[in-house]
């Protein structure tokens, strides 16, 4: 059966960039403009992706491969193959359905995308805050308070356990 398969199914001989045209005795016809086939033996060609709106064309469609899109500045890609564009925010902000909003006190975002995350709680590691956090930057933890003053007691009082991520003032 395998030996005669190509005789019984002439479409299997059609290479990528063509389709098996049933209207023309199953001969291999080139994909029409704005369409492609990425594999051989296809009976139709797929419509090329169009990069509209803030989608930009990163790679043009060819007869054997689809177009690829990315997003114009001010937006970034989301999803497989950049299926969506999502707006950027400034550092120190996060995106909500109401648009870009500043990070709440005790949280930060050092990127143009993603959500605000809580500051590191240095006291959980027995350390002290060396540099305070901001909306754009996490706190910098330093040595434990005991390490800073040799004469100090080695017992460090626990930090107040109110809202995690808030740096001591």
């Amino acid at each position: 059966f395998e030996r005669t398969r190509s005789l019984q199914d002439p479409c299997s001989n059609c290479p990528a960039g063509t389709f098996c045209d049933n209207n023309r005795n199953q001969i291999c016809s080139p994909c029409p403009p704005n369409s492609f086939s990425s594999a051989g033996g296809q009976r139709t060609c797929d419509i090329c992706r169009q990069c509209k709106g803030v989608f930009r064309t990163r790679k043009e469609c060819s007869s054997t491969s689809n177009a690829e899109c990315d997003c114009t500045p001010g937006f970034h890609c989301l999803g497989a193959g950049c299926s969506m564009c999502e707006q950027d925010c400034k550092q120190g902000q996060e995106l909500t359905k109401k648009g870009c909003k500043d990070c709440c006190f005790g949280t930060f975002n050092d990127q143009k995308r993603g959500i605000c995350r809580p500051w590191t709680n240095c006291s959980l590691d027995g350390k002290s805050v060396l540099v305070n956090g901001t909306k754009e930057r996490d706190v910098v933890c330093g040595p434990s308070p005991a390490d800073l003053s040799p004469g100090a007691s080695s017992v460090t009082p626990p930090a107040p356990a109110r809202e995690p991520g808030h740096s001591p003032q």
Partner: nanobody, 123 residues
Framework: EVQLVESGGGLVQPGGSLRLSCAAS????????MNWVRQAPGKEAEWVAN????????YYVDSVKGRFTISRDNAKNSLFLQMNSLRDEDTAVYYC????????????????WGQGTTVTVSS
């Protein structure tokens, strides 16, 4: 075919008004958040406004609050942007965009876009 087609752009004087429309086809319009996004010449693209599925939630970028109103007519598969008190800085190509399937769930990607309509504010 899933499609969005904007219309209503044009040349208007500062202080004037325009109403943009967006006709949707090929998908269940009433099931999606919808957005307006604009891109001014030589500037980054900017989200302008969005509206939820039934029109009960509407949000705007600060620069257009009190001047622009987003609305929708689900029976006619249409999205609108009423623009009043237009300023020079509102000059841009305005795009209609569909919110992605998980829009509002910590993701705000837009997956279907129109070709845009040009608004020029000039005296």
């Amino acid at each position: 075919e899933v499609q969005l087609v904007e219309s209503g752009g044009g040349l208007v004087q500062p202080g004037g008004s325009l109403r943009l429309s967006c006709a949707a086809s090929g998908f269940t319009f009433r099931s999606y958040w919808m957005n307006w996004v604009r891109q001014a010449p030589g500037k980054e693209a900017e989200w302008v406004a969005n509206i939820n599925q039934d029109g009960s939630e509407k949000y705007y970028v600060d620069s257009v609050k009190g001047r622009f109103t987003i609305s929708r007519d689900n029976a006619k598969n249409s999205l609108f942007l009423q623009m009043n008190s237009l300023r020079d800085e509102d000059t841009a190509v305005y795009y209609c965009a569909r919110g992605g399937p998980d829009y509002g769930d910590l993701h705000y990607g837009m997956d279907v876009w129109g070709q845009g309509t040009t608004v020029t504010v000039s005296s």
